[in-house]
């Protein structure tokens, strides 16, 4: 909370309200929607960001082929239930008592059911594949320059440890960024790959979550990298459980 600066704002989360009534009269920033105090020296969890958002006055061979168990977030926005640490609760329900299980990035991983549905544990998303298509440029980007720039971005802007950026693939105009982070690899204080991916997604859409910073200006050797399409695939440590009806649809 001390990272909230003297002017009492939260550099890493504009979806907060900050006031000088924290311990010792210091600036304290609370997430909209949940009222939870957030640590402004790091990324805010995706669950709290989604909750704030809902409450705010408001294919080539060299590329990775997502596995059959990969999830895409097709359900869109919802007002999630977050646990005491700001993470997604394993079971989410809407106002009409329809419930479903989610993974650690809040994406549905079961069919929808009723209040009797059980979600025994929050299943970790350990592999995220960010699939981007950039706008036409005079020529292809240099792969190693592109790789270095995206790794720098995740390290410096999102504070994600470089070891969690597993690979950057490129075959013009498609870029794929692979993030991997097993439960055993994630130490206290490490940014979660799900949170980093969400901040990146919002940046790419021109909806930066950072306070007062300009939007994302991605350049490779001075050449602007403008993204025209984004798809994100989520792979869980335990495969999702959907009925055959959905799988054959």
């Amino acid at each position: 909370h001390t990272a909230a600066q003297d002017n009492c704002t939260c550099p890493t989360n504009k979806m907060t309200v900050c006031s000088p009534d924290g311990p010792g009269g210091r600036c304290q920033c609370r997430a909209l929607g949940s009222g939870m105090a957030v640590d402004c020296s790091t990324l805010t969890s995706k669950c709290l960001l989604l909750k704030a958002r809902m409450s705010a006055p408001k294919n080539a061979r060299t590329l990775v082929r997502p596995s059959e168990h990969a999830l895409v977030d097709n359900d869109g926005l919802y007002d999630p239930d977050c646990d005491p640490e700001g993470r997604f609760k394993a079971r989410q329900c809407n106002q009409t008592s329809v419930c479903w299980c989610v993974n650690s990035v809040g994406v549905r991983r079961t069919d929808k059911g009723d209040l009797s549905l059980r979600c025994d544990e929050l299943v970790r998303t350990h592999h995220i594949l960010i699939d981007l298509r950039h706008r036409p440029t005079a020529g292809a980007f240099n792969h190693s320059d592109l790789d270095a720039e995206l790794r720098r971005l995740f390290r410096e802007r999102y504070r994600l440890h470089p070891k969690f950026v597993a690979a950057v693939h490129y075959e013009q105009p498609t870029i794929q960024i692979e993030l991997r982070q097993n439960t055993s690899q994630k130490a206290a204080g490490d940014v979660d790959i799900g949170d980093a991916a969400y901040y990146f997604e919002r940046d790419i859409k021109g909806e930066s979550l950072f306070q007062g910073r300009g939007g994302l200006d991605l350049r490779v050797r001075g050449e602007p990298l403008q993204v025209e399409r984004t798809l994100i695939y989520y792979l869980d440590e335990i495969p999702p459980k959907f009925s055959m009806k959905r799988l054959t649809a």
């Epitope: 309200v17 000088p20 009534d21 924290g22 929607g33 949940s34 009222g35 105090a37 006055p57």
Partner: antibody
């Protein structure tokens, strides 16, 4: 010095609405949350919700959502709590406080009596 | 919602003796840095008065016989040497998440 001064006692009929005001002075009104708390006769404290006058952001206790409305007039440094569809169990003293958890300054309280 | 359970409901202590009031939360209200628990004193016909903020920070103007401790789910308000003017009802409140609930109160009397 910091002061919160609330409006006077009210007597209302069931089904009516009441609007309690809380005038702040001695600090920058837009920088702090204003919380509202209910205390029924002989009972404990119950958190209703809060408002951040600097942006009009509000939070509500689900129990009061839909019936309580929190607003603020920054030009008058005054916060308001309106409670609608009054019933007998709304008879209570209502307090405003600066800050939410750990409210460091409180109004004197406004007694609202709901009686037919 | 986080439920705060205060104990005891009422307490009688002799003047000059130590008084201890407990507050247990239904889930942790602490991070590694801070505990989001606060203590108030309320005398009849008066608004609550903040004594302790963030579990252990004494509010300005509050006598140093009052102290707060605890983290996680268990918190304690201690009055080291009870004075006559300390007769009141004491409440804990968390500010971890919405709604910021209060404990049921502890009535402190002189034995």
């Amino acid at each position: 010095q910091v002061q919160l001064v609330q409006s006077g006692a009210e007597v209302k009929k069931p089904g009516a609405s009441v609007k309690v005001s809380c005038k702040a002075s001695g600090y920058t009104f837009t920088n702090y949350w204003i919380g509202w708390v209910k205390q029924a006769p002989g009972q404990g404290l119950e958190w209703i919700g809060d408002i951040y006058p600097g942006g009009g952001y509000t939070n509500y206790n689900e129990k009061f959502k839909g019936r309580a409305t929190l607003t603020a007039d920054t030009s008058a440094s005054t916060a308001y709590m309106e409670l609608s569809s009054l019933r007998s169990e709304d008879t209570a003293v209502y307090y405003c406080a600066r800050g939410t958890g750990g409210g460091d300054y409180w109004g004197q309280g406004t007694l609202v009596t709901v009686s037919s | 919602d986080i439920v705060l359970t205060q104990s005891p409901d009422s307490l009688a202590v002799s003047l000059g003796e130590r008084a201890t009031i407990n507050c247990r939360a239904s889930q942790s209200v602490s991070t590694s840095s801070y505990s989001y628990m606060h203590w108030y004193q309320q005398k009849p016909g008066q608004p609550p008065k903040l004594l302790i903020k963030y579990a252990s920070n004494l509010e300005s103007g509050v006598p140093d016989r009052f102290s707060g401790s605890g983290s996680g789910t268990d918190f304690t308000l201690t009055i080291s040497s009870l004075q006559a003017e300390d007769v009141a009802v004491y409440y804990c409140q968390h500010s971890w998440e919405i709604p910021y609930t209060f404990g049921g109160g502890t009535k402190l009397e002189i034995k």
